[in-house]
Interface confidence: medium
């Protein structure tokens, strides 16, 4: 039999942040290699990571074609002797299908995690401060250009700003559905800022981790009377 001594993959896990999407699984192979297949619900299976000894496969190129699709994936455990013929076939010498394990369905628009945002700049004019969040580039393409997180999520994506006086710990918050905040501050006081990306309509993976803290009086800020 062509499937002797093969072990089905297990612990299949999608790891996806800002649409960079990798499928991981166990175990490290012994007498076998792996091939991954991915498809949309209505599409044909496409093979990726042929005969790999890795326990992961980068599927970003496939899922960014349409981030609002539902994707199915499966990992085949292929016996060594069937993987050394140099042919991109999944089937053994007697035509039987090697064992495979299905991953849970993956909806990039719903399931990809939001990466840690970055405060691009802040500018103080009198008692107002404008804080700008970097519009992170994703690997989603349209017309040969990479789309930003805002391009992909539009108004579904909001940012929450946490800000506080350097001299105290009491935090205030502000929200925006653009990438900019305009907040009131006390003149003569230094403030610190941190932002978080949020997709309120989601039930899981709603929030990113907080950005690194940036404080006034450091390089990123500009001050105008």
């Amino acid at each position: 039999s062509g499937t002797t001594n093969t072990v089905a993959a297990y612990n299949l896990t999608w790891k996806s942040t800002n649409f960079k999407t990798i499928l991981e699984w166990e175990p490290k192979p012994v007498n076998q290699v792996y091939t991954v297949q991915i498809s949309t619900k209505s599409g044909d299976w496409k093979s990726k990571c042929f005969y790999t000894t890795d326990t992961e496969c980068d599927l970003t190129d496939e899922i960014v074609k349409d981030v609002k699709q539902t994707y199915l994936a499966r990992v085949f455990s292929v016996p060594w002797r069937n993987s050394t013929h140099g042919k991109e076939t999944l089937f053994g010498t007697h035509g039987e299908e090697p064992p495979f394990t299905n991953a849970r369905k993956f909806l990039p628009y719903r399931d990809t995690k939001l990466g840690q945002p970055t405060i691009q700049s802040f500018e103080q004019v009198g008692t107002k401060v404008n804080v700008t969040v970097e519009d992170e580039r994703t690997l989603v393409r349209r017309n040969n250009t990479f789309l930003s997180l805002r391009d992909v999520f539009g108004k579904d994506l909001i940012y929450t700003l946490y800000y506080w006086k350097s001299s105290s710990s009491g935090k205030k918050t502000a929200k925006t559905n653009t990438n900019e905040f305009l907040i009131d501050v006390d003149k003569g006081e230094n403030y610190c800022f941190s932002v978080q990306a949020v997709i309120p309509s989601r039930t899981v993976n709603r929030k990113s981790t907080d950005s690194p803290v940036e404080c006034m009086g450091q390089e990123k800020g500009e001050f105008r009377e």
């Epitope: 990798i22 175990p27 490290k28 012994v30 007498n31 000894t53 890795d54 992961e56 060594w80």
Partner: antibody, heavy 125, light 108 residues
């Protein structure tokens, strides 16, 4: 041949984060191996902390998972360990090691064939 | 978690004698994932045996490994003075990867 060298502070205060780096010399960190951290409490046996593949995928010991982060920097040929909220129980010698997949006669074998010399970390105020 | 139990805890032998060290797994381990290491005081572990029975590069042929499933053995056919050390078995097949508690081979 490949050599590993651990570096980082030898003394960490309780509740702080322990940070260690392992520098790979004599070979590329991207050459298809897994890279592990192991520790050994004074006078005790060996405990596997976790491992990372050059692409960044990780496996962690569930007993430490909530406190551990292992990362890789292929441009510097280094991988790193961060262990948060340390206590005196984290006092140990910390080793980095290469976990090699070795192909032979139709199959793969796995083992840790290259180890760093180890670095002693003491958690104390 | 796969627990590896090594026995005996300490083995007191004289140079030239044969040492037999046991490693028992709480569940079956593929031999491809089973290795043995030697550790001397103040040093990092050194790979001796991989795949349960294959000697690592540069390891003398007095060291041999055997076993499968849940029972594995490391044998040192004739102890040399430099062989007195602690020996660990390890599995890297199932997370968390685990080591046995070690067997200390000491001079009698």
């Amino acid at each position: 041949q490949v050599q590993l060298q651990e570096s980082g502070p030898g003394l960490v205060k309780p509740s702080q984060t322990l940070s260690l780096t392992c520098t790979v010399s004599g070979g590329s960190i991207s050459s298809g191996q897994y890279w592990s951290w192991i520790r050994q409490h004074p006078g005790k046996g060996l405990e596997w902390i976790g491992e990372i593949y050059y692409s960044g995928s990780t496996r962690y010991n569930p007993s430490l998972k909530s406190r551990v982060t292992i990362s890789v920097d292929t441009s510097k040929n280094q991988f790193s360990l961060k262990l948060s909220s340390v206590t005196a129980a984290d006092t140990a010698v910390y080793y980095c090691a290469r976990d090699t997949p070795y192909y032979y006669d139709g199959g793969y074998y796995y083992y840790m064939d290259v180890w760093g010399k180890g670095t002693t970390v003491t958690v104390s105020s | 978690e796969i627990v590896l139990t090594q026995s005996p805890g300490t083995l007191s032998l004289s140079p030239g004698e044969r040492a037999t060290l046991s490693c028992r797994a709480s569940q079956s381990v593929s031999s491809s994932y089973l290795a043995w290491y030697q550790q001397k005081p103040g040093q990092a572990p050194r790979l001796l045996i991989y795949g349960a029975s294959s000697r690592a590069t540069g390891i003398p042929d007095r060291f041999s490994g055997s076993g499968s499933g849940t029972d594995f053995t490391l044998t040192i056919s004739r102890l040399e003075p430099e062989d007195f050390a602690v020996y660990y078995c390890q599995q890297v097949g199932v997370v968390p990867y685990t080591f046995g508690g070690g067997t200390k081979v000491e001079i009698k």
